[in-house]
């Protein structure tokens, strides 16, 4: 449902994050220290352009644990 | 108190444009996303369309893509919404409503809407 | 697009009585649903979202219930401002689509 060209919005958009960021949290806006470039939120990148896994996941709220 | 005040009715003929504002007053314009909701005489209601204020991206309807636009002046904290080629059947109230949060909450704040004749 | 589906289109009900109304989604959009209420010449006022959640303001006699793709809009006694068209909208992804309206008349 988050390939490249996809849009999602709205509790979709919600749902998602809690999916692909588990139990981290997530950012709507990603906190300016971790934006590699300006950041719109992700509202904005993934609802009126198109997200990815990638991009969601630079959204949550902390780095996923290397096992 | 937070409020959204729309222009005036509107009669138009059919293959016209119109073009409706609204303003935003007693929170922060660009926090909030906004929404257009058009309601047909006696009918449900429809949306149309909705529009980030922060950077002016928009979002339309499949319906209304290519006839509608929605663009926005943040110096005035107002929203307008064009719709071109006009036909009968847009003969409606249209509403700007502020979106809630995160596009997923529904619409708390509505303008009192405004009439939009299409007629001959 | 996701539908909505409202049921019943209306009824007529007496001032104390419980009032149900129900809507479904053609799939399944979690709790992402919207009621609203909206008077004769009036802009429709939010008077639940995600489902259950009532807003500041609104009577606790207003209740909302469902999830996936069942809901229901419950008022526990109803009084003579609540007649009015209460409309469900789902927000779970665009786009945004309502129900065709719940007409509360006065028996």
């Known amino acids: 449902a988050y390939g490249p060209g996809e849009t999602l919005c709205g509790g979709e958009l919600v749902d998602t994050l809690q999916f692909v960021c588990s139990d981290r949290g997530f950012y709507f806006s990603r906190p300016s220290s971790r934006a590699n470039r300006r950041s719109r939120g992700i509202v904005e990148e993934c609802c009126f352009r198109s997200c990815d896994l990638a991009l969601l996941e630079t959204y949550c709220a902390t780095p996923a644990k290397s096992e | 108190q937070v409020q959204l005040v729309q222009s005036g009715a509107e009669v138009k003929k059919p293959g016209a444009s119109v073009k409706v504002s609204c303003k935003a007053s007693?929170?922060?314009?660009?926090?909030?996303?906004m929404h257009w909701v058009r309601q047909a005489p006696g009918q449900g209601l429809e949306w149309m369309g909705i529009?980030?204020?922060?950077?002016?991206?928009?979002s339309y309807a499949q319906k209304f893509q290519g006839r509608v636009t929605m663009t926005r002046d943040t110096s005035t904290s107002t929203v307008y919404m064009e719709l071109s080629r006009l036909r009968s059947d847009d003969t409606a109230v249209y509403y700007c409503a502020r979106d809630v949060q995160w596009l997923a909450y529904g619409m708390d704040v509505w303008g009192q809407g405004t009439t939009v004749t299409v007629s001959s | 697009d996701i539908q909505m589906t409202q049921s019943p289109s209306s009824l007529s009900a007496s001032v104390g009585d419980r009032v149900t109304i129900t809507c479904r989604a053609s799939?399944?959009?979690?709790?992402?649903l919207n009621w609203y209420q909206q008077k004769p010449g009036r802009a429709p006022d939010l008077l639940i979202n995600a489902a259950s959640s009532l807003q500041s303001g609104v009577p606790s006699r207003f209740s909302g219930s469902g999830s996936g793709t069942d809901f229901t809009l419950t008022i526990s006694s109803l009084q003579p401002e609540d007649f009015a068209t209460y409309f469900c909208?789902?927000?779970?992804?665009?786009?945004?689509?309502f129900g065709g309206g719940t007409k509360v008349e006065i028996k």
């Open positions: 529009i980030n204020p922060s950077g002016g991206s928009t």
């Open positions: 007693g929170y922060t314009f660009t926090s909030y996303y």
């Open positions: 909208q789902q927000s779970y992804s665009l786009p945004f689509t």
């Open positions: 799939q399944s959009i979690s709790s992402y």
